[in-house]
């Protein structure tokens, strides 16, 4: 089924990922800018 394929492969083929994360402070323990996932 589709749901099983989706589970096995992690994400539908051809779907665009989220934008690259932004690390605005340059600090090593910073958290990235939050972006919505685009799945």
């Amino acid at each position: 089924s589709y749901s099983m394929e989706h589970f096995r492969w992690g994400k539908p083929v051809g779907k665009k990922r989220r934008p690259v994360k932004v690390y605005p402070n340059g600090a090593e323990d910073e958290s990235a800018e939050a972006f919505p996932l685009e799945f």
Epitope: V13, G14, K16, R17, P19, V20, P24, E28, D29
Partner: antibody
Framework: SLEESGGRLVTPGTSLTLTCTAS????????ILWVRQAPGKGLESIGM?????DTYYATWAKGRFIISRTSTTMDLKIISPTTEDTATYFC???????WGQGTLVTVSS | DIVMTQIPASVEAAVGGTVTIKCQAS??????LAWYQQKPGQPPKLLIY???TLASGVPSRFKGSGSGTEFTLTIGDLECADAATYYC??????????????FGGGTEVVVK
């Protein structure tokens, strides 16, 4: 910080692997990009690895480069270099000010 | 793949003046755009992300605007230290058939 290594003079067709090493953070926790800059030219994005390990390449770079990582490093393999691959290669932590200083690859016969 | 078109390739302005650089994306990238400044022999420095948000330590003389496909970087009250090459960068998400990360060709800013 990030540091690239492995750049050197190679002859066309001789594969070369560049290594990106992080200090102060784990590469596997961040999105990492590979960018290059030919002498006197602009920036060119080669490919990237998301923090979850998914890898994507620019269309022109598919089949020419392989991005992989270990627990401590990120590698960029240039499969069969040509003279057009002569450039400084940077690894970059996502969109940020965390860039390595770059490593120079020269491809010449 | 995304294509970023940046104009002009070079611009000259006097100290205290204003420079405007434009960047056009080949398809909508929402606000996933950054601006970098690069000086010879150095890696690029992040100025702006999310099209209009100033990175830490960047003076407010730098202003980014735009969304979708059209973006602008404005540098006001030019200083000699602003002489550099500026790049826009898309950092849109990628897929198996689309690579969303691309740089503009760069704009050299000469300060007189």
């Amino acid at each position: 910080s990030l540091e690239e290594s492995g750049g050197r003079l190679v002859t066309p067709g001789t594969s070369l692997t560049l290594t990106c090493t992080a200090s102060g953070f784990s590469l596997s926790a961040y999105d990492i990009l590979w960018v290059r800059q030919a002498p006197g030219k602009g920036l060119e994005s080669i490919g990237m690895m998301y923090d979850d390990g998914d890898t994507y390449y620019a269309t022109w770079a598919k089949g020419r480069f392989i991005i992989s990582r270990t627990s401590t490093t990120m590698d960029l393999k240039i499969i069969s270099p040509t003279t057009e691959d002569t450039a400084t290669y940077f690894c970059v932590k996502g969109v940020s000010n965390i860039w390595g200083q770059g490593t120079l690859v020269t491809v010449s016969s | 793949d995304i294509v970023m078109t940046q104009i002009p390739a070079s611009v000259e302005a006097a100290v205290g003046g204003t420079v405007t650089i434009k960047c056009q994306a080949s398809q909508s990238i929402d606000s996933s755009l950054a601006w970098y400044q690069q000086k010879p022999g150095q890696p690029p420095k992040l100025l702006i992300y999310s099209a209009s948000t100033l990175a830490s330590g960047v003076p407010s003389r730098f202003k980014g605007s735009g969304s979708g496909t059209e973006f602008t970087l404005t540098i006001g009250d030019l200083e000699c230290a602003d002489a550099a090459t500026y790049y826009c960068q898309s950092y849109d998400g990628s897929s198996s058939s689309y690579y969303g990360i691309g740089f503009g060709g760069g704009t050299e800013v000469v300060v007189k």
